[in-house]
Amino acid sequence: AWELTILHTNDVHSRLEQTSEDSSKCVNASRCMGGVARLFTKVQQIRRAEPNVLLLDAGDQYQGTIWFTVYKGAEVAHFMNALRYDAMALGNHEFDNGVEGLIEPLLKEAKFPILSANIKAKGPLASQISGLYLPYKVLPVGDEVVGIVGYTSKETPFLSNPGTNLVFEDEITALQPEVDKLKTLNVNKIIALGHSGFEMDKLIAQKVRGVDVVVGGHSNTFLYTGNPPSKEVPAGKYPFIVTSDDGRKVPVVQAYAFGKYLGYLKIEFDERGNVISSHGNPILLNSSIPEDPSIKADINKWRIKLDNYSTQELGKTIVYLDGSSQSCRFRECNMGNLICDAMINNNLRHTDEMFWNHVSMCILNGGGIRSPIDERNNGTITWENLAAVLPFGGTFDLVQLKGSTLKKAFEHSVHRYGQSTGEFLQVGGIHVVYDLSRKPGDRVVKLDVLCTKCRVPSYDPLKMDEVYKVILPNFLANGGDGFQMIKDELLRHDSGDQDINVVSTYISKMKVIYPAVEGRIKFSTGSH
């Protein structure tokens, strides 16, 4: 028998520095977690203690904090090289700055293979990107070889900006021939490493003949065997065992997100490359693991540019941006409109001639807007200003919901109206009318939504049975502020870009902004 240790991360999302327990900015260092300096310590300990170790990343290193905003992927290449990753799969967020924003900072600089079998380049891009990412890589480990085959969510064109010269194929269809090729090369130990979410990971384990282990990402899935060490609730045991269609037991793993855990899986193979046993658990990277001081010093050196960036002007406002709780928790506020407009703008994807865009709607809890911005400071807007408006380090995500769920959400928005509670929704691509004289749960008297399958966008009544795409904060997607119906009834959820980054990009693009209160939210006569 031959034993392999797989160390894995996924959805790190630019958390290069240690974070608080909820993966936001570290405040009390003695209780902080993760970060590349701490990860390095643990990885080095394991590499020294065990003979056959692979360090893998399942995508979405890009996007999530000011680190990515400023360094645009150079930070990912630098610190992943320092940690000596063995391979990485492309995630959807690796395309957030277009293909060039992937090629130059990451693909050309990484000292490790970057993989995806289901992304095919065409046209002029094919020769430019050739060899910079691979469908698979055979890695010698000790006296054996291990094949790593990559995959990426086929929804990436809807979630990011890969452009028109990359085709995202069905994962299973694309993986099978590559695995078959590895088999013909006498590679009998094969890891599928990719970024399509836990459901697809399990399908790959079930359907792709020859895959021995699946290391996934995208869905931020936390798996654990035994008592979990922090706040995350396990979605199943680690590893999660799937019985393949040809009768094999295939371990599937994922390691939550944000670099909080290091996935640790030990696999025992027989001489024919069959998995005999698999066991392990994610390792919580808490303060009991010291940060490597040299990596920490390097982080601090890179940090300097971030501090400078946060005070630079992004653009100007010529109007007061009303982000006060007195406005945003009671009525339409122009800060809410600005943020929702930025959220929609960030998700413009012309992927189908029938649709002007794939999504037109935005909802945003008023309680998530934490500060106004005064235009009387020469109109200047900085990252620092936006960090006061959106201090929680969240993301603006894409969900699919039925009309009936949206209706419930808007009823919840005003079910206890008047108490300055955070659930009051700001909107984009939606016209809502409330009648507060009616009883809670029956206060939405009009709900019109902007069409997507149209050449001239217009507002049509919401249809209860229709499925709609909506951009919203991850906080709402996870049922925050009492929006349990969103969490319980959503049909799809893809995590998006860092909230501040979305708004800052929009402001930089627009240069001068002047959002108005324009009648997106109304109250019927006599009730307000």
């Epitope: 390095f40 310590t41 080095q44 300990q45 590499r47 020294r48 090289n81 320092a82 000596r84 063995d86 000292k111 490790f112 890695l139 010698p140 000790g142 010291p290 490597d292 001081p293 040299s294 990596i295 920490k296 010093a297």
Partner: antibody
Framework: EVQLVESGGGLVQTGRSLRLSCAAS????????MHWVRQAPGKGLEWVSD????????GYADSVKGRFTISRDNAKNSLYLQMNSLRAEDTALYYC??????????????WGQGILVTVSS | DIQMTQSPSSLSASVGDRVTITCRAS??????LAWYQQKPEKAPKSLIY???SLQSGVPSRFSGSGSGTDFTLTISSLQPEDFATYYC?????????FGQGTRLEIK
């Protein structure tokens, strides 16, 4: 300017002990792993031992395991190599070298000038 | 342990020549290879790390390439101060191991 200065070498009889020291300056000593590398007369370089920044991770070449002990005193910016049961084949120039990382197992960006250890029978 | 084999063991060249030294690892080491220069009676000096990254202060006539198991150190135009012994070292797997050295002498 980074400086590594070895001391404690000399002529010693087989089976006896010797303790090498390395005084470091010009960098934050307790941020980095440190190594001992040796070079027998007219021969190539051979890695001997390393120690991580906080002494948590320590390793030895098979040829010295059980006989040599590496240690460090971060308060004194010093690295040590206690060499027991010395053999003729331990005769070499011993270099103290700085790793680029705290947890070690990397390459060496700065080296001392070396100290000669001669083991005679 | 991973064995590192350098070739040639020694070579003679003239000032201005382009010189290439190769290093082969007994196992895959990705890009985790360093090159050192050692002059007689002196300590080794770091030249290149991660197979191709130049250490700060090292002249640009030195370059490194390769990945996997085969690596090269190239000196594009030999200068008098470049006559020395050159060592490769892998740091992919523990313990770190060195090549036996390549002695570069004046023709």
């Amino acid at each position: 300017e980074v400086q590594l200065v070895e001391s404690g070498g000399g002529l010693v009889q087989t089976g006896r002990s010797l303790r090498l020291s390395c005084a470091a300056s010009g960098f934050t000593f307790d941020d980095y792993a440190m190594h001992w590398v040796r070079q027998a007369p007219g021969k190539g370089l051979e890695w001997v031992s390393d120690i991580s920044w906080n002494s948590d991770i320590i390793g030895y070449a098979d040829s010295v395991k059980g006989r040599f002990t590496i240690s460090r005193d971060n308060a004194k910016n010093s690295l040590y190599l206690q060499m027991n049961s010395l053999r003729a084949e331990d005769t070499a120039l011993y270099y103290c070298a700085k790793d680029i990382y705290g947890s070690g197992s990397s390459f060496f960006d700065y080296w001392g000038q070396g100290i000669l250890v001669t083991v005679s029978s | 342990d991973i064995q590192m084999t350098q070739s040639p063991s020694s070579l003679s060249a003239s000032v201005g020549d382009r010189v290439t030294i190769t290093c082969r690892a007994s196992q895959y080491i990705s890009s985790w290879l360093a090159w050192y220069q050692q002059k007689p009676e002196k300590a080794p000096k770091s030249l290149i790390y991660a197979a191709s990254s130049l250490q700060s202060g090292v002249p640009s006539r030195f370059s490194g390439s390769g990945s996997g198991t085969d690596f090269t150190l190239t000196i594009s135009s030999l200068q008098p101060e470049d006559f020395a012994t050159y060592y490769c070292q892998q740091y992919h797997s523990y313990p770190p191991t060195f090549g036996q050295g390549t002695r570069l002498e004046i023709k």
